[in-house]
């Protein structure tokens, strides 16, 4: 059946009409408009942009557009007391200081309010001491240092290169190792692609460029002072000592010119292997401290940033559904940027703007979606996903009852090679079917589908002839919807070739050089990749909001559950003796997965055959589909992470950006051989298997015939 039948509208208002209305030229124009000045969260400039977007969404035709404000903890450098790092001699004189800010890009020399590079939420402090180089500061890097090399980081200032994992995890690891300060830097090995010029002549990071970013370990809490509840006018706020996720040691980021000065003098141990060497002309010695001639010199950090409760503003637009107005499909992306936001977030915000305009055009012609579509421009994402989380906390009762799906819309591009999708398994078939209908923008794939170019360039590691779709992790605004509330979620963007470009993210990420010109000159001059991403994101929203039967396939969840069960079992089987000793069995989990598979298969058969003209039965079947994701939520949450409640997926405890499957079991098994009380540790593994098995079985039963 056509996805329009239920809304009694003319056939011309279908997905094609929506997609045809999307224009690359408009996305380009919107991107330019959004990137001329900085839009840092909590600033007047970002408030003005919120009001502009509110006004334009109203003009585009949405039914209502409101600002939702919250007063949350943000962090800013001290304008009169800048942050920097020094090398000091034995007399305490500063013989080298890091740069106070990045040289501005051409055309932006006279722009005011460019926030200098800083690590948001760093405490104040002026620690001094010997330096230890800790590679990427991953869990395994500290294992190598402490266990294999017997290097003690206690009382040291550590220097870590950006990349591989979320910076907050690096800081947490350094704290646990006893460090008294952290210096983060961008190594050319990770942020300078060979054969490409640095900005403004290419998309590589110049030596004076620096990555900003927050260093929180919120674990989904939102505003650090009001975990679990909205930061509204009558909120009770924790004291700063009880705030969630704040780092306890000073942290500061630098570029590779300044890193060279710190690393070139390093003495102590040689790097353990080549994976610890970057591309600077330095030895990458681990330390501690400087080499012979410089051994009396120390490193000193000067950090004076302040944490301040500040008002932020989300923009929430509503396009009311004609048939099921109490079912919400949400498209959201953030508006706040570190500086100009040329890629992050405005390449995404410009796409959302054009999607809203297209939906508005259809609405003005008399069309309405079947279900309500909510559009969101989130604030303070860069400070810990605060805007989206506070709004979801405020509206959690509505969302858990009415939320069908959330589609995220941060950066539309991180490269221009192929599509990248992370989503719930429920959306796999939706994404496959949609991309088969869209044209590929890729060179050499003229006249071919997006599905074809995507599958060719990014094949699934498991299923031939299919594209790779990844697990959702975190580090973006879908987190609260998926990990806390259990609303089916997905994200899509254009990405780089991970085979040939091993650098982390894109080189100019969170630097002053992330400008409109970066996108227009080097990434997407024709804005054809932006248009494709608009078609994917918008197409997903259209289908989720308009199809009579929700475009979710529960059988795909069954497939991945089996895969994840196999994976976690094989991890556990690395300890066969202990599994025997402590009677650890995965039978209950595999049994639950088998049951889920059978019940999902039967449900899918019923879904093909039921009478779609019966609105009660239709609603019943759709509710079973909608609530399936919700069924994977454990109200008690994961151990020590109460806001990560999804039993199948959570952000990795070692890298917030990455998704982990069966995270409760995974974390219980992690490094289990080093636990002081093996009996207790394996007891926790058994408990987590029990929780996972119960949850999968309970979720399966939500798909059973209701009576």
């Amino acid at each position: 059946k056509s996805s329009n039948e239920a809304t009694n509208i003319t056939p011309k208002h279908n997905m094609k009409a929506f997609l045809d209305e999307l224009k690359a030229e408009n996305i380009k124009k919107f991107l330019y408009n959004f990137t001329q000045i900085p839009h840092l969260a909590g600033t007047e400039q970002n408030f003005q942009l919120a009001k502009q977007i509110q006004s334009q969404w109203k003009e585009f035709g949405l039914d209502s557009v409101e600002l939702a404000h919250y007063d949350v903890l943000l962090s800013y450098p001290n304008k009169t007391h800048p942050n920097y790092i020094s090398i000091i001699n034995e007399d305490g004189n500063e013989i080298f200081n890091t740069s106070l800010f990045e040289p501005p890009p051409p055309g932006y020399e006279n722009v005011s309010d460019i926030v200098p590079p800083f690590s948001a939420f760093s405490p104040q402090g002026m620690p001094e001491g010997d330096l230890v180089y800790v590679n990427y500061a991953r869990t395994e890097d500290f294992f190598k240092l402490e266990r294999d090399m017997k290097i003690n980081c206690s009382g040291k200032i550590v220097i870590a290169r950006y990349g591989k994992v979320f910076r907050g995890n690096k800081v947490k690891n350094a704290q646990l190792a006893g460090a008294k300060g952290v210096i983060l830097y961008s190594d050319p090995a990770d942020y300078f692609a060979p054969g490409v010029k640095s900005y403004p002549d290419g998309w590589n990071l110049p030596g004076g460029g620096v990555q900003r970013g927050n260093i929180l370990n919120l674990n989904g809490a939102g505003d650090p002072l009001t975990p679990g509840y909205p930061a509204n006018e009558y909120a009770y706020r924790r004291g700063i000592a009880e705030a969630v996720g704040l780092p306890s040691i000073p942290v500061h980021p630098i570029g590779y010119y300044d890193a060279q000065k710190l690393l070139e003098k390093m003495g102590g141990s040689a790097p353990p292997d080549s994976s610890w060497r970057g591309s600077l002309k330095v030895p990458y010695n681990v330390g501690p401290g400087f080499t012979g001639n410089f051994s009396t010199q120390k490193v000193k950090m000067h950090i004076h940033s302040t944490n301040e409760v500040t008002r932020i503003y989300n923009v929430i637009g509503t396009l009311r559904g004609a048939v099921e107005p109490d079912r919400y499909v949400i498209l959201g992306g953030h508006r706040d940027s570190w500086v100009f936001g040329g890629i992050d977030p405005q390449s995404g915000a410009a796409v959302v703007h054009e999607i809203v305009r297209s939906f508005g055009t259809l609405k003005k012609e008399g069309w309405r979606p079947r279900r309500t579509i909510l559009f969101a421009s989130w604030d303070a994402e860069e400070f810990g996903l605060l805007g989206s989380t506070e709004w979801a906390e405020e509206n959690s009762r509505l969302l858990q009852e009415r939320g069908v799906a959330y589609i995220n819309a941060d950066s539309s591009i991180e490269g221009n090679y192929t599509l990248r999708v992370d989503c719930t398994p429920l959306m796999y078939s939706l994404v496959h079917n949609l991309t088969k209908e869209l044209k590929s923008p890729d060179e050499g794939f003229e006249g071919k589908s997006l599905y074809e170019s995507w599958t060719k360039k990014s094949p699934s590691p498991e299923f031939s002839g299919m594209p790779r779709i990844s697990k959702l992790g975190s580090g973006n605004d879908f987190e609260v919807f998926f990990q806390r509330l259990g609303i089916a979620s997905g994200r899509a963007r254009y990405t780089k070739n991970w085979e040939t470009n091993k650098f982390s993210g894109y080189p100019l990420y969170h630097s002053v050089y992330e400008t409109y010109e970066l996108v227009e000159k080097f990434y997407d001059p024709m804005f054809k990749y932006h248009l494709t991403v608009a078609q994917v994101r918008g197409g997903m929203v259209f289908e989720l909001a308009n199809s009579i039967v929700l475009p979710f396939d529960c059988r795909d969840y069954a497939v991945v559950l089996r895969k994840y069960a196999d994976k976690i079992y094989s991890i556990s089987m690395k300890h066969p003796q202990e599994m025997k000793t402590y009677s650890v069995s995965f039978d209950s989990l595999f049994s639950a997965v088998k049951n889920f598979t059978e019940i999902a298969s039967k449900f899918s058969e019923r879904l093909q055959d039921f009478d779609k003209s019966n609105p009660i039965v239709l609603r019943m079947m759709n509710d079973q589909l909608m609530f399936l994701e919700r069924a994977f939520i454990d109200p008690l949450g994961l151990p020590d992470r109460p806001f990560y409640r999804h039993v199948i997926y959570a952000p990795s405890s070692h890298n917030k950006y990455a998704g982990e499957s069966f995270p409760g079991i995974y974390d219980a098994l992690f490094d289990i051989e080093s636990k002081v009380d093996p009996s207790k540790a394996w007891g926790e593994v058994k408990r987590q298997i029990y929780v996972a098995a119960f949850t999968v079985q309970a979720a399966a039963e939500t798909l059973s015939e209701v009576a």
Epitope: I95, F96, N97, S99, L100, F101, E102, P103, P104, P106, E109, K197, S198, Y199, P200, D201, P206, G207, G208, Y257, K261
Partner: antibody
Framework: EVQLVESGGGLVQPGGSLRLSCAAS????????MAWVRQAPGKGLEWVAN????????YYLDSLKSRFTISRDNAKNSLYLQMNSLRAEDTAVYYC?????????????WGQGTTVTVSS | EIVLTQSPDFQSVTPKEKVTIQCSAS?????MYWYQQKPDQSPKPWIY???NLASGVPSRFSGSGSGTDYTLTINSLEAEDAATYYC?????????FGQGTKLEIK
């Protein structure tokens, strides 16, 4: 040996034109931004113009933008400065310089300079 | 445009003495460069990115500073150091030089 050799200087009347050339050798010319810097008699250094690797972007001292044009020919390892509507205050030694840090300008190799005299 | 002001304009110094030349920027800059020029010679790169010595520069020279205030220091002056020193900002166009500081040996 890395070398820059300027030529084309001389005496010119006010309102006249001159084209300076700089021949580069001993390095991969197209891998560097290049610049012209001048020094009036008994005065300090004054940056005139920069050009990026392939000549697609040029940057000038504002007061000279309408009269001076920097260009390069990578095939010939050569840098040029076309100077029109010359004035007495343009009298200076003009140095060609290699710019090590790209757009932001650190001049690590200098030529010996060529003298331009604007006088009637 | 960022104006760089060097002080002093001129300094007459005894060999072995410590010398400091200041360069003050009208607004903050990211890095400072220094050049040495002797009479009838081209300028030579001397210190780059605030504190790095160019190739062949003696270790008695050092550079430091950040923001608006930068310093070139000669720990123990030698006769061959007599020259004019120029600072230059690495920050924004137009690229600008200080007016120069002439060092003379007493």
């Amino acid at each position: 040996e890395v070398q820059l050799v300027e030529s084309g200087g001389g005496l010119v009347q006010p309102g006249g034109s001159l084209r300076l050339s700089c021949a580069a050798s001993g390095f991969t010319f197209s891998d560097y931004y290049m610049a012209w810097v001048r020094q009036a008699p008994g005065k300090g250094l004054e940056w005139v113009a920069n050009i990026n690797y392939d000549g697609s972007s040029t940057y000038y001292l504002d007061s000279l933008k309408s009269r001076f044009t920097i260009s390069r020919d990578n095939a010939k390892n050569s840098l040029y400065l076309q100077m029109n509507s010359l004035r007495a205050e343009d009298t200076a030694v003009y140095y060609c310089a290699r710019d090590l840090d790209g757009y932001y300008g650190y001049f690590d190799v200098w030529g010996q300079g060529t003298t331009v005299t604007v006088s009637s | 445009e960022i104006v760089l002001t060097q002080s002093p304009d001129f300094q007459s110094v005894t060999p072995k003495e410590k010398v400091t030349i200041q360069c003050s920027a009208s607004s903050s800059v990211s890095y400072m460069y220094w050049y040495q020029q002797k009479p009838d010679q081209s300028p030579k790169p001397w210190i780059y990115r605030t504190s790095n010595l160019a190739s062949g520069v003696p270790s008695r020279f050092s550079g430091s500073g950040s923001g608006t205030d930068y310093t070139l220091t000669i720990n123990s002056l030698e006769a061959e150091d007599a020259a004019t020193y120029y600072c230059q900002q690495y920050h924004s166009y137009p690229l600008t030089f200080g007016q120069g500081t002439k060092l003379e040996i007493k």
